[in-house]
Interface confidence: medium
């Protein structure tokens, strides 16, 4: 049978020929009658065999990491017979490892993110090196990790390559660190090979900084003419944190006047001071308010960094604006009796300059020929007034500052013209009356009514009478109905068209004014030739025809 030991050949041997071992048949008695042959991959090129002795030699340098074993076949032949002495057999040559490979970090580049202020022991990242040498061959591939750069903030576990935090870090001081890790094989013993890798460790932000005002005092101005909602200026705080942790909210901490507000511009992180109520320079020309700023998002565990909000004081000066004169009232109503003489007193309007300099005021009336106003605001008449022409006057009074004629205010002034009894009552219309020749006594000829252009505080009451001469010698009489109407009646029987075709009756109408006024009104009565029925209709028809130029038969 075949006789051999296990074959090993060290890798990386530089000699031209290295004895690996000897193959032999136990039938070989050493008389050189056997011939040994080597077959298979590597036979003749990597390994050769001495045909007489069966000694195997490696004739080239081997690399275990490239090929760690060779499977060859051996034959032995009897030279004399040419026959195989032993059956062909497979054998193995193992390449033994030497420490010729340094550890390599295959997953480079390494980058890790860890929150700032993380406690000691916090895991950052695990780095792993690979060693191509044989892990089963001694310590050639047994690795130890160490930190070449990164103390005192980081540490590495020697056997696992786990990087941990060893000291708290503040992102606001330094936001990233380069850590260099070395991996050594041979568990660090002499002759060990090493490899290094760099790890970029970035610190993510936590909200460990509160916003702080850039200034302890801001000075702003606001015009007294500014409407509510006006932005009067901005204030700004800074926060060393970033992103969401730097988002802030501004608010008013102190404003006894409740005149201002602060809103936050979340894009610029500025506080905008807003006018909440209109200001008045003459009432208060400056204000002091205190503003505070806080982060929008604060985790409970970080509250200790946000105990006292930063505050600032804002000085706000109100800028004076020349304001138009201010009337004491929004409008005035005055009364004056009609028929008072020119120059009569109507009333007084008053306006003042609301500004501190108190400019004198000049007054004027817009487009009025009836009234005048002086520099004291006294309104007088320029003409006598007639209520029956105009009972009310709507005036526009203008006040102008003497020192700044552009500052003008106007208000309406209403003047009511009060009635006096200066008009007597008169017929409400023109009356044309008719009486038949054959009319009997006491026949109603006409109902009359009166009007009075004067205004009556109570009801008008009119008194109707015939004139003295008509009363004494009248063919007609009058009855006052006591309701501002009266009826005219015949005072005799029969009239003569030929002798007296028309009567003119003077009617006195008096009012109940103080003093009472009376007017004389003439009533025309036509005598008609009537039919038997006593109707004056035909008479009226004849009158109409005559007035139109027709002659009736």
């Amino acid at each position: 049978g075949w006789v051999w030991n296990q074959f090993f050949v060290p890798e990386e041997m530089n000699t031209t020929s290295h004895h690996v071992g000897r193959l032999r048949s136990d039938l070989d008695n050493g008389n050189n009658s056997f011939q040994y042959k080597l077959l298979g991959a590597g036979a003749g090129s990597t390994f050769i065999i001495d045909e007489r002795t069966g000694d195997i030699y490696a004739i080239e340098k081997l690399d275990r990491e490239e090929r760690s074993l060779y499977i060859l076949r051996a034959q032995v032949i009897d030279i004399t017979t040419g026959r195989a002495v032993e059956p062909e057999s497979e054998f193995v040559i193992k390449v033994s490892d030497i420490n010729d490979n340094e550890p390599k970090f295959l997953d480079e580049p390494y980058e890790a993110i860890v929150p700032e202020m993380s406690p000691e022991g916090t895991l950052v990242i695990q780095v792993t090196a690979s060693d191509a040498d044989d892990p089963s061959s001694g310590n050639n591939a047994r690795l130890l990790y160490s930190l070449l750069q990164g103390q005192p903030y980081f540490s590495v576990e020697p056997t696992t390559g786990v990087i941990r935090i060893s000291s708290k870090m503040d992102r606001e001081l330094q936001d990233e660190y380069w850590v260099i890790i070395q991996a050594k094989d041979m568990i660090g013993q002499p002759g060990a090979l090493s490899g290094t890798t760099s790890v970029l460790i970035k610190l993510s932000d936590v909200n460990d900084n509160k916003p702080i005002f850039k200034e302890s005092l801001y000075r702003l101005t606001v015009s007294e003419s500014a409407p509510t909602g006006t932005s009067i200026g901005t204030i700004m705080a800074y926060d060393n944190d970033i992103g969401e942790n730097a988002e802030m909210d501004y608010s008013i901490e102190e404003d006894d006047s409740q005149t201002f507000d602060i809103i936050t511009n979340h894009e610029t992180q500025e506080g905008i001071v807003i006018l909440k109520k209109k200001v008045n320079f003459e009432h208060q020309n400056h204000y002091g308010i205190r503003a505070k700023v806080k982060n929008h998002h604060v985790d409970k565990q970080l509250m200790k960094y946000h105990t006292e909000a930063s505050t600032t004081f804002i000085k706000i000066q109100v800028e004076d604006v020349d304001e138009p004169p201010l009337f004491l009232l929004p409008y005035y109503i005055f009364e004056i009796f009609e028929e008072t003489p020119q120059g009569s007193f109507v009333g007084v309007v008053s306006a003042t300059d609301p500004d501190n300099r108190k400019s004198p005021i000049r007054y004027s009336i817009t487009r009025s020929k009836v009234f005048n106003i002086d520099d004291n605001g006294t309104i007088t008449t320029t003409n006598s007034l007639d209520r029956e022409i105009s009972a009310w006057y709507n005036l526009s009074i203008t006040a102008t500052e003497k020192y700044n004629i552009e500052q003008i205010s106007s208000i309406p002034v209403y003047v009511q013209v009060l009635n006096i009894n200066d008009h007597a009552p008169e017929f409400s219309q023109y009356y044309e009356s008719y009486v038949c020749e054959n009319a009997g006594s006491g026949q109603v000829i006409q109902t009359i009514s009166a009007v009075d252009r004067d205004e009556s505080i109570e009801e008008h009451h009119f008194y109707f009478n015939l004139s003295v001469e008509d009363t004494n010698s009248s063919s007609f009489t009058i009855i006052d109905n006591q309701d501002n109407t009266a009826v005219i009646l015949t005072n005799r029987t029969g009239f003569n068209l030929q002798e007296e075709p028309i009567f003119y009756i003077s009617i006195l109408i008096a009012d109940n004014g103080i003093p009472s006024l009376t007017s004389t009104n003439t009533l025309t009565i036509h005598v008609c030739d009537c039919d038997d029925s006593g109707s004056t209709q035909t008479c009226q028809y004849q009158e109409l025809m005559l007035s139109m130029g027709f002659k009736t038969e």
Partner: antibody, heavy 119, light 107 residues
């Protein structure tokens, strides 16, 4: 040491002009609003004018508006009051005063300079 | 403008006594913007109290201020010889106006 020293006072005829100065030392002058206040035997203490820390805003009492001008030179730590068209009633001791940052009261005063307007 | 009226005009007291000075405003002083000053002959006024009740830096605690709205008081709990002077109140809520002063003299 922190102090304010006024100068420039004197006797002047009505209608004439005078310029007062106030030298500041011992503090950051350019950070403070500064005022002039005067004191007369008759009217007591009377505020005259204020100028903001950077000179951007100026305000005056009604009694001096249009006649007096307040100014400052922060590079020289000096406050000025130019007084024109002086009147007899402007006779007073003129103090320069420093306003506090958080209000409008005066936490530092000079010793004053006397201005006498007389014919 | 806001007119400040101080009373009494003169206060005659002995050292060790309590002094109470009054300052009344013609209208409400916003945000208690009222200050007190002390002035000695030939000297500039010196700030004692601001914000109606806050003591200025370096002012002894025998000086105290109180009040709001229109009525304010300066109290000197125990008069020291150096406290005899003229005291002025000043409002700074609307422009700047001063009271006419109260003289505290030795009795």
């Amino acid at each position: 040491q922190v102090q304010l020293v006024e100068s420039g006072g004197g006797v002047v005829q009505p209608g004439r002009s005078l310029r007062l100065s106030c030298a500041a030392s011992g503090f950051s002058f350019s950070s403070y609003d500064m005022d002039w206040v005067r004191q007369t035997p008759g009217k007591g203490l009377e505020w005259v004018a204020v100028i903001w820390y950077d000179g951007s805003n100026k305000y005056y009492a009604d009694s001096v508006r249009g006649r007096f001008t307040i100014s400052r030179d922060n590079s020289k730590n000096t406050l000025f009051l130019q007084m024109n068209s002086l009147r007899v009633e402007d006779t007073a001791v003129y103090y320069c005063a420093r306003e506090t940052g958080e209000g409008w009261y005066f936490d530092l005063w000079g010793r004053g300079t006397l201005v006498t307007v007389s014919s | 403008e806001i007119v400040l009226t101080q009373s009494p005009g003169t206060l005659s007291l002995s050292p060790g006594e309590r002094a109470t000075l009054s300052c009344r405003a013609s209208q409400s002083v916003s945000s208690s913007y009222l200050a007190w000053y002390q002035q000695k002959p030939g000297q500039a006024p010196r700030l004692l109290i601001y914000g109606a009740s806050s003591r200025a830096t370096g002012i002894p605690d025998r000086f105290s201020g109180s009040g709001s709205g229109t009525d304010f008081t300066l109290t000197i709990s125990r008069l020291e010889p150096e406290d005899f002077a003229v005291y002025y109140c000043q409002q700074y809520g609307s422009s700047w106006t001063f009271g006419q002063g109260t003289k505290v003299e030795i009795k």
